[in-house]
C-alpha cells in the first residue's frame, strides 16, 4: 500500500522520496529490503540515505531492487517502500512506455508540461526540452522555472517531452532526464441553440438556368467539441437522400470550422444543370444538436443572364 | 467525509472491565493510526494511546499501559479501547480521534463525539 | 514527559479586545498544536504546526511560537470564542496537552 515505483536511467542520477510522508524532525532509516542491509547516510557512497530521500548518484542497473524506509514518528514507526528500476540507456531516440511518467493535457489556454520530480533535486535554470528527442527552438517554446510553456498550442504539438537538467550534489554534477507525454485537448466547451449563419431565412438566391448552383447551409452550436450536432438540407421537407433527383446531392461530409472560437458546421447543397422545376422546390436548411432544431427555408429565382452589351 | 461513532454510555462497577468502540466510516480505516485521548476535569486532555489498523502496532502513554487495551477490527473499520480495573477516577469522557494527514501528525482533526463512562458502586 | 503548561488557566475579555494565551513546554518541541473546546462537544482541531489555521477558522486567530514557547492570539475577541483552549505536543511520546486555558466572554 505504502510503495511507489521509481525509474531511472543508468549513469543519470536518481533520487526517490519514501513513500512514506513525515515532519522534517522525524528520522528516517533506509534498507536494502532484500538483505535488510542499512543503507549509508554518508555522503561519499554513491548509494546514500538522506532524510525522506534515498539518493543514487550516479545509478547503476544493479540498483534496481525494493529499499524500506522507515520514518520514526514519536508515536509509530511507519514503513514505506520504494520499487526502483535502472534501466540501460536506449541507443535510438525512442522512450520506452516504462520510462514515461504520467500524461499531462494542455489547451490554448494552459500549456504548462511540468518536468517530472524535479523538485527533488538540486537543479537550476534552465532545463532544456526535447520533443521526440529534438531540441525544442523558437519563440513559441518558453523554460519557465520547472516547466515548459508553449504558445499557441496546436494539435501538432502532442507528442512525448523530455526535460534535461543537472542535478548538483557538493560541487559534483550528474545529469538527469524525464520523459512525459502531452497531449492538446479542446477548451472546456458548452452548447448552444443552433444558430443559422446562412442561407438567411426565407432568403431568395438567384440561379441560372442551365448552369450549376451551391447553397450553403452553416450553423454553429456553441464553443468546444459538439456532440450530436448537425447541418443538412431538405427538399420540400424530404431528405436530399430520398428525393429522388440525382441533380440535387449534398456534399459528402460536413466541413468543421471554428469562427471566433464557435463551433460550426456547414454543408454544401449542389445543384447541377439547374431546371424550371427546381425553381419551385422549397430548399430547407437544418440545424439541430441536443439543444432542438433551427429551420431556414431558401427559395430560389431566376436570374436574368446580364446583357454586356448594353 | 470523515466520521468517527462512538458507542454510548456506561454505567459499571468499579474493578469490572468496559469495551468502548469507534466506528469510522469516509475513508480507508487502515490508512489511518487511531487515537484515543480522555478529557479529565483535572489534566483536561489526556492522551491514552493509539493503534496502527494495518499492523495491530501500538502505542502508549506509559500511565496507561495496565488500563488499557486497544484492537481494530478492518473488516468491520472499527477500533475498541478495553479499559479494565476501573476506579471512580477512570470516571470521564473518551475520545478517538485521528490526524488530518496520518503521516505529518499534523494535529488531531477528526474526533469521535465522545463516549461517558461512569465508574458507580 | 513533555509537561505542558498553559497560562491563564482562565481568563475573560470584551467584544474587540486583543486575546493572548501562552503555552510553555518543559523541553523543546518543533510544532504546537491548538485545540478549541467548547462544553459538551468535543475539541475542535483550531492551529495546528505552530501557526496554520485549521479549515474553517476565522482569520482573527493566529499563532506562533518556537522552542519550548507557544501562543495564540485572537486580534478581536468575539462571542463565539469563548471556549476552553489546550496546546498539544507531538515531538515526543507520550503526546501531552496542556490543561487548557478557559476563556470568557466579559
Known amino acids: 500500500k505504502f510503495s511507489k515505483q521509481s525509474w531511472g536511467l543508468e549513469n543519470e542520477a536518481l533520487i526517490v522520496r519514501c513513500p512514506r510522508q513525515g515532519k522534517p524532525s522525524y528520522t528516517v532509516d533506509w534498507y536494502y529490503s532484500q538483505t535488510n542491509k542499512s543503507i549509508p547516510t554518508q555522503e561519499r557512497n554513491r548509494v546514500f540515505a538522506s532524510g525522506q530521500l534515498l539518493k543514487f548518484l550516479p545509478a547503476a542497473v544493479a540498483d534496481s531492487g525494493i529499499y524500506t524506509c522507515i520514518v520514526r514518528s514519536p508515536t509509530f514507526n511507519r514503513t514505506g517502500y520504494a520499487n526502483v528500476t535502472i534501466y540501460k540507456k536506449q541507443s535510438d531516440c525512442n522512450v520506452p512506455d516504462y520510462l514515461m511518467y504520467s500524461t499531462v493535457s494542455g489547451s490554448e489556454k494552459n500549456s504548462k508540461i511540468y518536468c517530472p520530480t524535479i523538485d527533488l533535486y538540486n537543479w537550476t535554470a534552465p532545463l532544456e526540452w526535447f520533443k521526440n528527442c529534438q531540441a525544442l527552438q523558437g519563440s513559441r517554446y518558453r523554460a519557465h522555472k520547472s516547466f515548459l510553456v508553449i504558445d499557441n498550442v496546436m494539435t501538432e504539438d502532442a507528442g512525448d517531452y523530455t526535460c534535461k537538467f543537472i542535478h548538483n550534489e557538493n560541487g559534483a554534477n550528474y545529469s538527469v532526464t524525464a520523459t512525459r507525454s502531452f497531449t492538446v485537448k479542446d477548451e472546456q466547451g458548452f452548447s448552444l441553440f443552433p444558430v443559422i449563419g446562412a442561407p438567411a431565412q426565407n432568403e431568395i438566391k438567384e440561379v441560372e438556368i442551365g448552369k450549376n448552383a451551391n447553397l450553403t447551409c452553416s450553423a454553429c452550436f456553441g464553443k468546444g467539441t459538439q456532440f450530436l450536432a448537425a447541418v443538412l438540407w431538405q427538399l420540400n421537407g424530404t431528405k436530399i437522400t430520398d428525393f429522388g433527383e440525382p441533380r440535387i446531392q449534398q456534399e459528402e461530409g460536413q466541413n468543421q470550422s471554428f469562427s471566433n472560437g464557435l463551433a460550426c458546421l456547414d454543408m454544401v447543397l449542389r445543384i447541377a444543370d439547374v431546371k424550371e422545376e427546381d425553381l419551385l422546390l422549397q430548399y430547407d436548411c437544418l440545424a439541430l444538436n441536443l439543444h432542438g432544431l433551427r429551420r431556414h427555408t431558401v427559395r430560389l429565382s431566376r436570374k436574368n443572364p446580364i446583357d454586356h452589351h448594353s | 467525509q470523515v466520521q468517527l461513532q462512538q458507542s454510548g454510555a456506561e454505567l459499571v462497577r468499579p474493578g469490572a472491565s468496559v469495551t468502548l468502540s469507534c466506528k469510522a466510516s469516509?475513508?480507508?480505516?487502515?490508512?489511518?493510526?487511531m487515537y484515543w485521548v480522555r478529557l479529565t476535569p483535572v489534566h483536561g486532555l489526556e492522551w491514552i494511546g493509539a493503534?496502527?489498523?494495518?499492523?495491530?502496532?501500538?502505542a502508549f502513554n506509559q500511565k496507561f499501559k495496565g488500563k488499557a487495551t486497544l484492537t481494530a477490527d478492518k473488516s468491520s473499520s472499527t477500533a475498541y479501547m478495553e479499559l479494565r480495573s476501573l476506579t471512580s477516577e477512570d470516571s470521564v469522557v473518551y475520545y478517538c480521534?485521528?490526524?488530518?494527514?496520518?503521516?505529518?501528525?499534523?494535529?488531531?482533526?477528526?474526533w469521535g463525539q465522545g463516549t461517558l463512562v461512569t465508574v458507580s458502586a | 514527559q513533555i509537561v505542558m503548561t498553559q497560562s491563564p488557566a482562565i481568563m475573560s475579555a470584551s467584544p474587540g479586545e486583543k486575546v493572548t494565551m501562552t503555552c510553555s513546554a518543559s523541553?523543546?518541541?518543533?510544532?504546537m498544536h491548538w485545540y478549541q473546546q467548547k462544553s459538551g462537544t468535543s475539541p475542535k482541531r483550531w492551529i495546528y504546526?505552530?501557526?496554520k489555521l485549521a479549515s474553517g477558522v476565522p482569520a482573527r486567530f493566529s499563532g506562533s511560537g518556537s522552542g519550548t514557547s507557544y501562543s495564540l492570539t485572537i486580534s478581536s475577541m468575539e462571542a463565539e470564542d469563548a471556549a476552553t483552549y489546550y496546546c498539544?505536543?507531538?515531538?515526543?511520546?507520550?503526546?501531552?496537552f496542556g490543561a487548557g486555558t478557559k476563556l470568557e466572554l466579559k
Open positions: 480521534t485521528r490526524a488530518f494527514d496520518n503521516d505529518n501528525d499534523d494535529g488531531f482533526a477528526y
Open positions: 469516509g475513508y480507508t480505516f487502515t490508512d489511518s493510526e
Open positions: 493503534i496502527d489498523p494495518e499492523t495491530g502496532d501500538t
Open positions: 523541553s523543546s518541541v518543533n510544532y
Open positions: 504546526d505552530t501557526s
Open positions: 498539544q505536543q507531538w515531538s515526543s511520546n507520550p503526546l501531552t
